[in-house]
Interface confidence: low
């Protein structure tokens, strides 16, 4: 069974999928639709890299621009480096400015909802 067939079978169960499963799916040419992506757990989406989201969505990645103000896309954008977001060619704004250091302080993030940034 290839990636697309597998995705069709599991599509209705994906809402609660953990990050690891999403990372695995991104390697299987599934082209997840935006409606499914928007239903994913925010905490599962946040750790995904720009490259992983691009692979996960395929051509549907274009839809991120229309959803940039909505969760989980909004929160995911805040976690990405701006220069990585720029590679999508979508004009997504709000990423971590180039030259900033991201500290993965989970308690800080849990309290504030945003990653902790140190200036250049």
């Amino acid at each position: 069974m290839n990636g697309s067939e597998y995705f069709v079978k599991i599509q209705s169960f994906l809402g609660g999928a953990p990050t690891e499963d999403l990372k695995a799916l991104s390697q299987q040419n599934v082209s997840m639709d935006l409606a499914t992506f928007m239903k994913l757990r925010t905490d599962a989406v946040l750790p995904l890299t720009v490259a992983e989201v691009q692979k996960l969505l395929g051509p549907h990645v274009e839809g991120l621009k229309a959803e940039e103000r909505h969760r989980p896309v909004r929160d995911w954008i805040l976690r990405q480096r701006q220069d990585d977001l720029d590679t999508l060619g979508l004009g997504l704004q709000g990423g971590i400015p180039n030259g900033y250091l991201v500290l993965d302080l989970s308690m800080q993030e849990a309290l504030s909802g945003t990653p902790c940034l140190l200036g250049p």
Partner: antibody, heavy 120, light 107 residues
Framework: QVQLQQPGTELVKPGASVKLSCKAS????????MHWVKQRPGQGLEWIGN????????KYNEKFKSKATLTVDKSSSTAYMQLSSLTSEDSAVYYC?????????????WGQGTLITVSA | DIVMTQSQKFMSTSVGDRVSVICKAS??????VAWYQQKPGQSPKALIY???YRYSGVPDRFTGSGSGTDFTLTISNVQSEDLAEYFC?????????FGGGTKLEIK
């Protein structure tokens, strides 16, 4: 509602270039990819490429990479496609269509199309 | 490139009948398929996206089905205004590609 204005016809000479326009209204022009599609008389549809107006990022069908150049003018919400070194094979109707429907790359809205006739 | 094949170039049907337009993809495209209707001298009109979801305003006599490589557009209770050409399109991967079209003729 979404509207896409395209000139009706263009008569051009072999070897010349032509710049087609597509003026969009009824949605946030900069947020959605604009696609271009070719249809030769009595034939099927071919995807040429697309452009995201927010930063001018483009994707092209390899077949049209040396034929078409996509640009936008954000101030007038207009997308352009320049076709170069025209031959009779380029005689066709060219449509613009924004990716603007729930994150699906299906083409929900189409311009009326511009008929290009290449003739000496 | 993914090739979308509509092997029937023409189909003939009568008002009130049910007709199925078939589209086959050269490789698996999941449910990333759209269907369009094009009447003579007009732009294409979107009917179906994600293989089975109707765009708003599309009559419910148009139904899309299928996944993987085999897709069907079914028109039940065909009306005279359904005289048109029907195209499938995949958007699973770039370049986006269309089927060659199936012309529906009303007897």
């Amino acid at each position: 509602q979404v509207q896409l204005q395209q000139p009706g016809t263009e008569l051009v000479k072999p070897g010349a270039s032509v710049k087609l326009s597509c003026k969009a209204s009824g949605y946030t022009f900069t947020s959605y990819w604009m696609h271009w599609v070719k249809q030769r008389p009595g034939q099927g549809l071919e995807w040429i490429g697309n452009i995201i107006p927010s930063n001018g990022g483009t994707k092209y069908n390899e077949k049209f990479k040396s034929k078409a150049t996509l640009t936008v003018d954000k101030s007038s919400s207009t997308a352009y496609m320049q076709l170069s070194s025209l031959t009779s094979e380029d005689s066709a109707v060219y449509y613009c269509s924004p990716h603007y429907y729930g994150g699906s790359p299906g083409f929900a809205y189409w311009g009326q199309g511009t008929l290009i006739t290449v003739s000496a | 490139d993914i090739v979308m094949t509509q092997s029937q170039k023409f189909m003939s049907t009568s008002v009130g009948d049910r007709v199925s337009v078939i589209c086959k993809a050269s490789q698996n495209v999941g449910t990333n398929v759209a269907w369009y209707q094009q009447k003579p001298g007009q732009s294409p009109k979107a009917l179906i996206y994600s293989a089975s979801y109707r765009y708003s305003g599309v009559p419910d006599r148009f139904t899309g089905s299928g996944s993987g490589t085999d897709f069907t557009l079914t028109i039940s209770n065909v009306q005279s205004e359904d005289l048109a050409e029907y195209f499938c399109q995949q958007y699973n991967s770039y370049p986006l590609t269309f089927g060659g079209g199936t012309k529906l003729e009303i007897k």
